[in-house]
Amino acid sequence: KGMHVAQPAVVLASSRGVASFVCEYGSSGNAAEVRVTVLRQAGSQMTEVCAATYTVEDELAFLDDSTCTGTSSGNKVNLTIQGLRAMDTGLYICKVELMYPPPYYVGMGNGTQIYVIDPEPCPDSD
């Protein structure tokens, strides 16, 4: 089975190092508890950028020190990653797990290629 997860192919981060994208998952029923994880893939290496669990009653809540923020609406999650620099350019995969009620489902998006360009330093003005 598995679950279909859709996310944009490419996103360009803002000059402030902020990138936003929507992660949408296909679910036949209404999941009471959902976990969303953003993974960064660099070659064969996979690292967790951030993760959050939300319920029908509660809004999506990342840890206070997380680089991510987000909101949820039905089967869509609006994700924002902050503090990005040029070296963070890469493929960001949205992983969705329907934790409750049974059955458990996991779904992986194909990844969003986030391009980050460091801003040019402002020239000194006399």
């Epitope: 508890e33 996979m46 669990t53 996991v106």
Partner: antibody
Amino acid sequence: QVQLVESGGGVVQPGRSLRLSCAASGFTFSSYTMHWVRQAPGKGLEWVTFISYDGNNKYYADSVKGRFTISRDNSKNTLYLQMNSLRAEDTAVYYCARTGWLGPFDYWGQGTLVTVSS
Amino acid sequence: EIVLTQSPGTLSLSPGERATLSCRASQSVGSSYLAWYQQKPGQAPRLLIYGAFSRATGIPDRFSGSGSGTDFTLTISRLEPEDFAVYYCQQYGSSPWTFGQGTKVEIK
């Protein structure tokens, strides 16, 4: 490096209980879901049970539902399997396994043998 | 529950030959959620392939996976002596997690 080490196996009589442990090291334990998988002598792999990151969500195979309980202590980096009302058909090597980022079981312990016999 | 059926049960081949193992699912499995494992006697299973065709870290390129929907294949292009073992397919997209019954690759 990632390591999973099971312990607690042994010989036990039918109807009795046993508790298995799986000590994890080399990774952030709380960031991964975990499983127990068993293998009866000369047989294939059978998934037994799953536990979520925080331990709030648990799933069981029908064959062990109501008898086995999975739990975890993230502060001790340890996974547990409490096995009650053991039967002869529960005789197997029990493996703990980590769920990789993309879903497959990427690391396994060496296994611990549980023999249920009178 | 998704039932996985592997064939053949046993494959008798010589080193250097090509091995083709089949895994058929009772219902569609997204290709992102199909894995292959290798198990040698007295050892724990080892992840070979995930997402139907991606090799796990450290797995030699003679191992390859293919397929989608309900039919999946593990191919070992040229069997090395250390490849003789039992191979299991697994679906991990939904609970309950299920394994095939295994295919034993033995020396002819």
